[in-house]
């Protein structure tokens, strides 16, 4: 059985079927003879009793007040009364967005971590027997899914899954076609157990060198296990036999991440090694970070401000 409407403040969209179900329903069945009444109050009108004659759009059942459909002028306070039991709701009916398949104010937001299980199931237990078909839309584009009674998405989340998913149930009542829309705003976030990798130290490093000597450029990063760290240089000039990447070293941090170090060794420094960028990059699925080294002849040191130097 559909659970009762316990929330005291409810916002709904005009033009959709809607119901209020009071929370002493089981008790009401026991006391069949007890007088049960539904009331509405809004603005100037105080406690007007509702009955099917009040409006052709309203239907009353034992426990439920149904709207076929709910309209803007249904905004107000609703009361269910039975003996000493009273339940009150404040209903706010908002305007439908005519330019979209959903109304922004009626969206449920969900955050899903990338690679984690992601599920959307289009169900509506209260109207289940009246639903002819159900469609699932992503950003207002219909998704072609096998099951047109209860369309479902079950997968491991990817960043491309982010968007607005709208379940639209189509149903008939008294010869009229209605639809009920439930929209989820799905945001896919980076796996929270992963960090965005970062290179340690300044982003630009001028290194004072002497021609004919060797230099070791150390690139250190904090990264995840599957991330990569590499040097990039000489894109246009082809390979330089004097430049060597040393073996990557890693140490695990107490938090379970990795501290990596990768050295670029430049032997017998020549003119061609000066004033060019040696870039070290750390890359992951969550982003990249790059730092650059420029070799400068020691004699030219005076031309560069002291704070940019790495010795």
């Amino acid at each position: 059985a559909e659970s009762c409407t316990s929330r005291p403040h409810i916002t709904v969209v005009e033009g959709e079927p809607f119901y209020l179900k009071h929370c002493s329903c089981s008790l009401a069945h026991e006391i069949e003879t007890t007088t049960k009444s539904w009331y509405k109050s809004s603005g100037s009108q105080e406690h007007v009793e509702l009955n099917p004659r009040s409006s052709s759009r309203i239907a009353l059942h034992d426990c439920v007040l149904e709207f076929w459909p709910v309209e803007l002028n249904d905004t107000g306070s609703y009361f269910f009364q039975m003996k000493n039991y009273t339940q009150k709701w404040k209903l706010n009916v908002i305007r439908r967005n005519k330019h979209s398949c959903f109304t922004e104010r009626q969206v449920t937001s969900k955050i899903v971590e990338v690679k984690k299980f992601f599920q959307i199931t289009c169900e509506n237990s209260y109207y289940q027997t009246l639903v002819n078909s159900t469609s699932l839309y992503k950003n207002c584009k219909k998704l072609l899914l096998e099951n047109n009674k209860n369309p479902t998405i079950k997968k491991n989340a990817e960043f491309e899954d982010q968007g607005y998913y709208s379940c639209v149930h189509f149903l008939h009542h008294n010869g009229k076609l209605f639809n009920i829309t439930k929209t989820f705003n799905i945001t896919i976030v980076e796996d929270r157990s992963n960090i965005v990798p970062v290179l340690l130290g300044p982003k630009l490093n001028h290194v004072a060198v002497e021609l004919g000597k060797n230099v070791r450029l150390n690139c250190s990063a904090l990264l995840n296990e599957e991330d990569v760290i590499y040097w990039m240089f000489g894109e246009e000039n082809g390979s330089d036999p004097n430049i060597h990447e040393e073996k990557e070293m890693r140490i695990m941090t107490p938090e379970g991440k990795w501290h990596a170090s990768k050295v670029l060794r430049i032997e017998n420094i020549g003119e061609s090694n000066l004033n060019v960028l040696y870039n070290c990059t750390v890359a992951s699925t969550g982003g990249t970070d790059t730092k650059s080294f420029i070799l400068v002849r020691k004699a030219d040191m005076a031309d560069i401000p002291g704070h940019v130097f790495t010795r």
């Epitope: 690679k115 491309e160 990059t281 699925t285 990249t288």
Partner: nanobody, 114 residues
């Protein structure tokens, strides 16, 4: 959803050759600088060869003169021609892009016996 499917690995004698392929789907392949990485047992994933969007290749020291990276933008495929293979080249080979990575594929195992 970007998918990377590497293939072409296998068992080969030292001195032999293999050609690896990487089929990329779900993204604009031609806009990405691409690379081959490898991970040997007990070691970290390392960059082996990369190729810019304009087709300029670059290689790690250990494979220079033996490996050749290429790309076919029409087929959304990256290749790695590996010649004069050595036992040290034994690893799982992965392709990915330069920059923010796509999710890694399964890789393809290359085993070079002496």
């Amino acid at each position: 959803e970007v998918q990377l499917v590497e293939s072409g690995g296998g068992l080969v004698q030292a001195g032999g050759s293999l050609r690896l392929s990487c089929a990329v789907s779900g993204s604009t392949f031609s806009d990405a600088g691409m690379a081959w990485f490898r991970q040997a047992q007990g070691k970290w994933r390392e960059l082996v060869a990369r190729i810019s969007t304009s087709g300029i290749p670059n290689y790690a020291d250990s494979v220079k003169g033996r490996f050749a990276i290429s790309r076919d933008n029409a087929k959304n495929t990256l290749y790695l021609q590996m010649n004069s293979l050595k036992p040290d080249d034994s690893a799982v080979y992965y392709c990915n892009k330069i920059g923010t990575l796509w999710y890694w594929g399964q890789g393809t195992q290359v085993t070079v016996s002496s």
